[in-house]
Structure formats: structure tokens, C-alpha cells
């Protein structure tokens, strides 16, 4: 168990005291408080909430709480010139228009400043043309259209259903296919679970509900106008033409009632197979264009949103460490929401608030953590992880020297079935040990550990008797800490049963219907799942900040490195002739992984035996653990993605939300059979194997005895 010399609480009760102080009723109260009005990034309401949180964190007992502001590029609809899509006839008359707003949920009819559904950062434009249905607009969907079906999207408006991959990837794919506009819609197949009523009578998406969201392809850049540097008072800003990641074609989201009207007239090719059919009563024809009687009708988009440099505010709270104040454990989650943020983000922000309160209570009783804990309420996450990224850019020198770990705290729930954890392998053992000590909130697991219910409901595909822990991808505020800076990171939330619920995310994600009542009535009436998530997130922070020896196990990295090397080798072996022709060998990578495994094993043995009372040796061993994640960072970054610098993990180039292992090699191999210059393509594969092998070997050497 944890212990700490700087406390007047009996050491073995430290963690227990912290966990016992966390209360479901408080989380409920905080969630209610945070969700009564919209808190859109860049608005006065969100600034006021930042000041409220600052004030409350001070009251809770943190040593200091500051606002950190930045002036970043945001995007808003034009209040007097609404965005919509129409069907026009041959005379140019609009014979159908999509809705301008979502019908407000009961009790919220008089709330002002509900931003209508829009795709943030869409350029302005009024393209018109034939429609092509592109399924989820994934890379493989465009391959199917262009290569197999010989359907050309050039000059067309494409309509894609939300789900499976990050919406920004959909837009990027559509742009590359030559489309001149994108319509995004929520299909009931993905956002309406069978047997559940739509809101307000259940947690399903009504036909008028629409998912908002940004459509950037930032690849970790942060503010599009100041990549790599903070958007502070003296920042040099790029011109809009040079901004990072902005889409070049108009994009707009709609609900399934409006989608029905567009899709029911579609003609052209039939869907290639059943995986292209959703649940609407339409043929899901691919197009291009409308069927016979309607062939002269076109679709026209009317997009008038504007991009504006706007001030945002992070709240940064500090609880100074008693022994190692220059070692930082960070707990961060965002505060800005698209509308009410009932789940995203306030179910997470309420948990952070309660964790801060519990830590503050212990501090008031005379306790301090061994290491400094930083608490963050990030702004403008919904606009591209901007608040966290700008703060990390501003503080990068401190973070890369002092950052021990980052724990993310966005939505606490996306379901109420079981725990979901994504983290660095360094934290596997921490998560396992912690969840064995926590009680499961699940029905049928009374008196059982969280580890047991989690393992039963979400078993590891590789190791029996263990739960699934996933790779970190992106799409949330840990990105800059993990993918750019190489700070060990993790996230935890309660999730749905992915086996039985095939819909993407949760149905009301980023809609006006994501309210306090959604959570209180349908997801977690007792707030027991929120409490469990608070215990997991808070418990991880507690251990990371308080353990004498950092709770990282480098042997778990060795295990996954071997798994990832095997996986990428098997992908490459789908091209045996080319590997022979171009002398492609993975020997260097497997050798590096073997060395890493042996050195990690020896390091772990030394970790058991060294004299923990010697502060210099203790600090040395902890520094080797802290800097191991950093050792996987390549200062040059990945090809064309300079802010994704982790060699072992990166967000997938085809889906920002998903993590990819050995991403440099993976991307070099991806679709390699379609590269016209195989010599060049296989040369890049060889280069990426070299980079990966070198990085793994270099990381291994950081664990060797120092002299």
C-alpha cells in the first residue's frame, strides 16, 4: 500500500481516507450545477463557469488556482444567416430545406444561446450538385466506391453517416475523393438502440437530434494558427490559408428525419452489400444523383459559419507535493460543451470536482501528496483539444522534465455496463491492483471487486483472467501529453456492452438532448457508476502522486512491444515477394524488443532490491521509470505529423479516435500494393523499421544500470 512521510494520517489509511471521502451525492449535485445552461467554448457563460470552478477549487483547499487564457481560432454559425441544406428543382427553387435547430428538450424551451447544429470550422459556401452516399466515409468505403464500383465523387456532394471513425477523417477522405461538400447524418442503425425510446422517454436519439462536432485534421497541432507554440498575447498567427487542419469544403450535420428526405430519392448504383445499409426506410442507393423522376433535382448546401480568434480559459489548480514538488501528476478534463454537456464533459468535470474536494479535505487535515498534483479544467476541447494543447505548449519545458503522469477526465460514462480503460502499458499493473481494491457497482457483482466484474464483462483478448485495456488513440485532452510529450497517460470511464450495442458512442452524443436528466433518469440514477469512475481516476492519481516508487511496470511494455512487432510483421508478410525483392527485414526490431525485454526484467529485479531509504537512488530509479515513456518520443515526429511523436502509439491515420501501434511502419505498409513506386514505398517501410528498432533499443538503454 502507499505510504508517505509527509502526513499526519496513518499511512495505510491514506488511500482509504481519500476514497471514502468521495460521495455520489456530491457528484450528482456538481453535475446538476454544471449543466443548467450551455457552456460553449469562447462564450461568457463558459468564462463564468471557469471563475466559479476557480473559486470552488480554492475553497476546497488547493494551494493555488489560476486561469490560463489563450486566443485561439474557434468557429460559430452566423446568428442571422443560418446553415441549412436544400433540395432544389431544375428552376433552382428550394423544394425541401433541412431544419435550422433541434427541438429543445422539455424544460429547456426558454434557454438562450443554444448553438444550432453545425460542423465547426466548415468553410462558407453554397455548393450544389448530385449526391453520393459514401457509407461511413472511411478509407475503405472510398476504396469500395472508387476502385470496385468505379464511382467518382469528384464534384459531388457526399452524404456520410456518423460513426465508426472521427468525423474529421470522414471529411478529409471526402476532400481527397474530390467532393465539393459533405453532409453528415446520424443513422438509427448507429444511434438508435433497439427496444429503447427516444429522448425524453429514453436515451435514444430522436429524428430531429443532431450531432455537433469539429471537422479538423489537426494531427495534434492545437490552435490552427499557432502550431507548436502557445496562442498568447504576443503570438505570431498564420494567415487563414496557412492554418493547420482546416477543411476546404463545406460540411453540415443533420438528423435522420432530414436524412430520410435526402436519401429516399437516391438513384444510381445499389449499395454494394448489406454493411452499407442503415435502418432508414430508404434504398441506400449510392448514386450519383437522384432516381428517374427526381433526376433533375440537386442538393444545395448553405453554409455561413465564421472562424474567429476568441479567448479561452483553462483553470489550473495546484496541490504542492511535500517531498517531490517538482514532479507533476496531472488530472485534467474539459469544461466546454456543445450545449448542456450532460455527459460530455460535465459527467467528467463533476467527478474531477469531487476528487479535488476529497484531496482538499485531506490537505486541510494536514496531509500532502508526495508529488505535486495539478488539476485542470480545459477549455475548447470540442474545437480541437485547444485548451490543453496550448497550455502544454506553453509549459512544455516544465512538463517534459517534470511530468510523471496525466490522467484524463472527460465523460465519466458512455454507458453503464462495465469499466473501460485506455492507458500506457506502464499503468496496467496500477489499474489492475487498484480495481482489485475497489467494489464493483454492477448488479450481480455485489461484494465482488471491480476487477472481477470488469474482467468478466470485458475480458482481455490475449490474457485469460484479465480485463481488456485498450491503446490510447486521440480525440481527447491526453493527446498532447502522451502523443507529443511522452508523458505516461491513462483514461477510464464506464461504457456500454459493445457486443450487443453496435451503435457508435452513445446516441445523444453532442446533441441538445445531452442533459442532466438524461444521466439522472436513464444512465446512472444512483450515481454509483460516476462514483466508481471517480474512485478509479482519483485512485490512480493518488497512487501516482503518493507511491514511494512510481507504480509503473516496464515489463508490461516489453510484452506489448513483442505483440505489436508480431502484428506489424504479419501485416508486412502479406507481401512476401516484395519483402524478398527489397530485402525487407524485421530482425532489427525483434532484436531491439528482445533487448528491451531482458533489460526491463533486470530493471524490475533491481527495483525490488534497491535501498528505498536512499533518496538519491530512489529518485534515480523513479526518474528511469518516469522518463521511459519519454524515451519513445522521436523529436522529428511521424511523417507529415510532426506533433505525433510517439513511435509506439499514434492516433490512426484513418480514425483519430483509435490508437495504432508502430504507426510509422503501419502507415508505410498501408495500401502499399497501390503505390505506383514500390521501390520508394518499400524503402519507406525499411526506414520506419529502422526508426522503430532504434527507438525501442534506445528506450531499453534508459533502463540499463546507469554506470
Amino acid at each position: 500500500k502507499s505510504s508517505n512521510e509527509a502526513t499526519n494520517i496513518t499511512p495505510k489509511h491514506n488511500m482509504k481516507a481519500f476514497l471514502d471521502e468521495l460521495k455520489a451525492e456530491n457528484i450528482k449535485k456538481f453535475l446538476y450545477n454544471f449543466t443548467q445552461i450551455p457552456h460553449l467554448a469562447g462564450t461568457e457563460q463558459n468564462f463564468q463557469l471557469a471563475k466559479q470552478i476557480q473559486s470552488q477549487w480554492k475553497e476546497f483547499g488547493l494551494d493555488s488556482v489560476e486561469l490560463a487564457h489563450y486566443d485561439v481560432l474557434l468557429s460559430y454559425p452566423n446568428k442571422t444567416h443560418p446553415n441549412y441544406i436544400s433540395i432544389i428543382n431544375e428552376d433552382g427553387n428550394e423544394i425541401f430545406n433541412t431544419s435550422l435547430f433541434e427541438p429543445p428538450p422539455p424544460g429547456y424551451e426558454n434557454v438562450s444561446d443554444i448553438v444550432p447544429p453545425f460542423s465547426a470550422f466548415s468553410p462558407q459556401g453554397m455548393p450544389e450538385g448530385d449526391l453520393v452516399y459514401v457509407n461511413y466515409a472511411r478509407t475503405e468505403d472510398f476504396f469500395k466506391l472508387e476502385r470496385d464500383m468505379k464511382i467518382n465523387c469528384s464534384g459531388k456532394i457526399v452524404i456520410a453517416r456518423y460513426g465508426k471513425v472521427f468525423r474529421g477523417n470522414k471529411v478529409k477522405n471526402a476532400q481527397l475523393a474530390g467532393a465539393k461538400g459533405v453532409i453528415l447524418y446520424s443513422d438509427p442503425a448507429d444511434y438508435f438502440a433497439p427496444g429503447v425510446k427516444s429522448y425524453p422517454d429514453g436515451w435514444n436519439l430522436p429524428g430531429g437530434g443532431v450531432q455537433r462536432g469539429n471537422i479538423l485534421n489537426l494531427n495534434g497541432a492545437g490552435d490552427p494558427l499557432t502550431p507548436g507554440y502557445p496562442a498568447n498575447e504576443y503570438a505570431y498567427r498564420r494567415g487563414i490559408a496557412e492554418a493547420v487542419g482546416l477543411p476546404s469544403i463545406p460540411v453540415h450535420p443533420i438528423g435522420y428525419y432530414d436524412a430520410q428526405k435526402l436519401l429516399e430519392k437516391m438513384g444510381g448504383s445499389a449499395p454494394p452489400d448489406s454493411s452499407w445499409r442503415g435502418s432508414l426506410k430508404v434504398p441506400y442507393n449510392v448514386g450519383p444523383g437522384f432516381t428517374g423522376n427526381f433526376s433533375t433535382q440537386k442538393v444545395k448546401m448553405h453554409i455561413h459559419s465564421t472562424n474567429e480568434v476568441t479567448r479561452i480559459y483553462n483553470v489550473i489548480g495546484t496541490l504542492r507535493g511535500a517531498v517531490e514538488p517538482d514532479r507533476y501528476v496531472i488530472l485534467g478534463g474539459h469544461r466546454d460543451s456543445w450545449v448542456f454537456g450532460g455527459i460530455d464533459p460535465q459527467s467528467g468535470a463533476a467527478v474531477v470536482h469531487e476528487i479535488v474536494r476529497s484531496f482538499g479535505t485531506l490537505k486541510k487535515e494536514g496531509w500532502r501528496p508526495r508529488r505535486t498534483i495539478l488539476f485542470a479544467s480545459w477549455d475548447a476541447e470540442e474545437f480541437g483539444l485547444l485548451g490543453s494543447t496550448e497550455w502544454a505548449e506553453e509549459n512544455s519545458r516544465l512538463l517534459q522534465e517534470r511530468g510523471v503522469a496525466y490522467i484524463n477526465a472527460d465523460s465519466s460514462i458512455e454507458g453503464n455496463y462495465t469499466l473501460r480503460v485506455d492507458c500506457t502499458p506502464l499503468m496496467y499493473s496500477l489499474v489492475h491492483n487498484l480495481t482489485k481494491e475497489l467494489k464493483s457497482p454492477d448488479e450481480g457483482f455485489e461484494g465482488k471487486s471491480l476487477y472481477e466484474s470488469w474482467t468478466k464483462k470485458s475480458p482481455s483478448p490475449e490474457f485469460s483472467g484479465m480485463p481488456r485495456i485498450s491503446k490510447l488513440g486521440s480525440g481527447n485532452d491526453f493527446e498532447v501529453f502522451f502523443q507529443r510529450l511522452g508523458i505516461a497517460s491513462g483514461r477510464a470511464r464506464y461504457t456500454k456492452n459493445w457486443e450487443t450495442n453496435k451503435f457508435s458512442g452513445y446516441p445523444l452524443y453532442h446533441s441538445v438532448y445531452e442533459t442532466y436528466e438524461l444521466v439522472e433518469k436513464f444512465y446512472d440514477p444512483m450515481f454509483k457508476y460516476h462514483l466508481t469512475v471517480a474512485q478509479v481516476r482519483g485512485g490512480m492519481v493518488f497512487e501516482l502522486a503518493n507511491s514511494i516508487v512510481l507504480p509503473f511496470d516496464c515489463r508490461d511494455y516489453a510484452v506489448v512491444l513483442r505483440k505489436y512487432a508480431d502484428k506489424i510483421y504479419s501485416i508486412s508478410m502479406k507481401h512476401p515477394q516484395e519483402m524478398k525483392t527489397y530485402s525487407v527485414s524485421f530482425d532489427s526490431l525483434f532484436s531491439a524488443v528482445k533487448n528491451f525485454t531482458e533489460i526491463a526484467s533486470k530493471f524490475s529485479e533491481r527495483l525490488q532490491d534497491f535501498d528505498k531509504s536512499n533518496p538519491i537512488v530512489l529518485r534515480m530509479m523513479n526518474d528511469q521509470l518516469m522518463f521511459l515513456e519519454r524515451a519513445f518520443i522521436d523529436p522529428l515526429g511521424l511523417p507529415d505529423r510532426p506533433f505525433y511523436r510517439h513511435v509506439i502509439y499514434a492516433p490512426s491515420s484513418h480514425n483519430k479516435y483509435a490508437g495504432e501501434s508502430f504507426p510509422g511502419i503501419y502507415d508505410a505498409l498501408f495500401d502499399i500494393e497501390s503505390k505506383v513506386d514500390p521501390s520508394k514505398a518499400w524503402g519507406e517501410v525499411k526506414r520506419q523499421i529502422y526508426v522503430a528498432a532504434f527507438t525501442v533499443q534506445a528506450a531499453a538503454e534508459t533502463l540499463s544500470e546507469v554506470a
Partner: antibody, heavy 117, light 108 residues
Framework: EFQVVESGGGLVKPGGSLRLSCVVS????????MNWVRQAPAKGLEWVSS????????YYADSVKGRFTISRDNAKNSLYLQMNSLRVEDTAVYYC??????????WGQGTLVTVSS | DIQMTQSPSSLSASVGDSVTITCRAS??????LNWYQQKPGKAPKLLIY???SLLSGVPSRFSGSGSGTDFTLTISGLHPEDFATYFC??????????FGQGTRLDIK
């Protein structure tokens, strides 16, 4: 390096048949669509036929449709062109070529088919 | 089907000269255009793909440009081994794969 070797060409009378073969090495044959392209004496290049990796998608130029049949055997790294009802205008050098999304990438040295009475 | 028209059909030049061959598509093909070189009795060899990308091993005196419907192949400073026939080919909408009729480059 890559090697594409055609065979089976020769002299045939109008109305006759020939079967061209093509064996490849240096690339993983089963990963690629394949084409036959021909070139009449002192003339330009004319695409004849394409076949997808798993033989599910097959295309022919209008000039040979109904007379020529393309096929492949991935296990043998081989591509075939069965040519029936041959005409004088089918006289050409026939090239087997790897297709990379419409780009005719690696060509064999060609095999000459002469249709003459 | 997309038609490809090359011009000129033949041209004469001397070693060291620079020459330009043009290719026009009957409709926009974005940058999906390839250039091939063919010497007598030999198979065509790919030189340039997607209008301007030089294949590994192809000398840098060869360059391509254009997008949409109009494309050019330029050889800056002819070498003796460059005298051959050059074909353009669209890979935008296939099948059918369509080639230009060829441009024969002779030594003056």
C-alpha cells in the same frame, strides 16, 4: 527485381484460337489486378482486358468482348488470356502488365500474335 | 470513355535540346495521368505517375506537369538514350485504360 514473362504467342489463322500465359515474380501476384495490353505493328497501345485480384471483376475492351477470356491462377502466379475467333486485326504484341489502380505498372517483354491466312 | 490526345505525333530534336510533349484528356482527370517511354522492340516503361511524380530511378531531366485536362512531359537536355516513343495514359476512370496515340521523338 520484378519479372513478367509472357508466352503462347504465334501464327494462327483467322477464326483460330490461342492461349497466352504470363508468369510473374518479384511481387505478390495475388495482391494485384492484372491487365493485358496489346500493340499492333507500328501502332499505339490498346488495353484489352483486366482482372481483379480474386477474379470477381473482369473487364474487356469492346473490340474483344465475347471472344477473349481473361483468367488467373494465384497459386501459380499466372495470368492467362484465352483468345478465340481471332481476326486479322488482333495481330499485335500482347503485353501482360501489373495494374496499380489504373496505372499499368510492370510490363512483360510481350508475345507476338500473328493472325493471317 | 475518356479519350487522350497527344501532340505532336512526332518531333525531331538534338542531344542537349529540351522538348515538351502535351497530352489532352476529353474530360477532367484531376492529376491521374501517367507517362511511358517505349523503345523499339521493348515494352513500355513508366516514367511519371500522377502527372508529376517521377518514378524511382528515372533521371530528373524528365518532368511532368498539369492537371484537369491539359498535361505536359518535358525533357530538359536530351540524352541519346531518350530518343523513343512516349505515351500518356489516364488512370482516373478505369476500365477502360486509355492511352494517347504516342509521340515519336527522333534524333535530328
Amino acid at each position: 527485381e520484378f519479372q513478367v514473362v509472357e508466352s503462347g504467342g504465334g501464327l494462327v489463322k483467322p477464326g483460330g484460337s490461342l492461349r497466352l500465359s504470363c508468369v510473374v515474380s518479384g511481387f505478390t501476384f495475388s495482391n494485384y489486378n492484372m491487365n493485358w495490353v496489346r500493340q499492333a505493328p507500328a501502332k499505339g497501345l490498346e488495353w484489352v482486358s483486366s482482372i481483379s485480384t480474386g477474379s470477381s471483376d473482369i473487364y474487356y475492351a469492346d473490340s474483344v468482348k465475347g471472344r477473349f477470356t481473361i483468367s488467373r491462377d494465384n497459386a501459380k502466379n499466372s495470368l492467362y488470356l484465352q483468345m478465340n475467333s481471332l481476326r486479322v486485326e488482333d495481330t499485335a504484341v500482347y503485353y501482360c502488365a501489373r495494374d496499380i489502380i489504373g496505372t499499368t505498372r510492370d510490363w512483360g517483354q510481350g508475345t507476338l500474335v500473328t493472325v493471317s491466312s | 470513355d475518356i479519350q487522350m490526345t497527344q501532340s505532336p505525333s512526332s518531333l525531331s530534336a538534338s542531344v542537349g535540346d529540351s522538348v515538351t510533349i502535351t497530352c489532352r484528356a476529353s474530360q477532367s482527370i484531376n492529376n491521374y495521368l501517367n507517362w511511358y517511354q517505349q523503345k523499339p522492340g521493348k515494352a513500355p516503361k513508366l516514367l511519371i505517375y500522377t502527372a508529376s511524380s517521377l518514378l524511382s530511378g528515372v533521371p530528373s531531366r524528365f518532368s511532368g506537369s498539369g492537371s484537369g485536362t491539359d498535361f505536359t512531359l518535358t525533357i530538359s537536355g536530351l540524352h541519346p538514350e531518350d530518343f523513343a516513343t512516349y505515351f500518356c495514359q489516364q488512370s482516373f476512370s478505369t476500365p477502360p485504360i486509355t492511352f494517347g496515340q504516342g509521340t515519336r521523338l527522333d534524333i535530328k
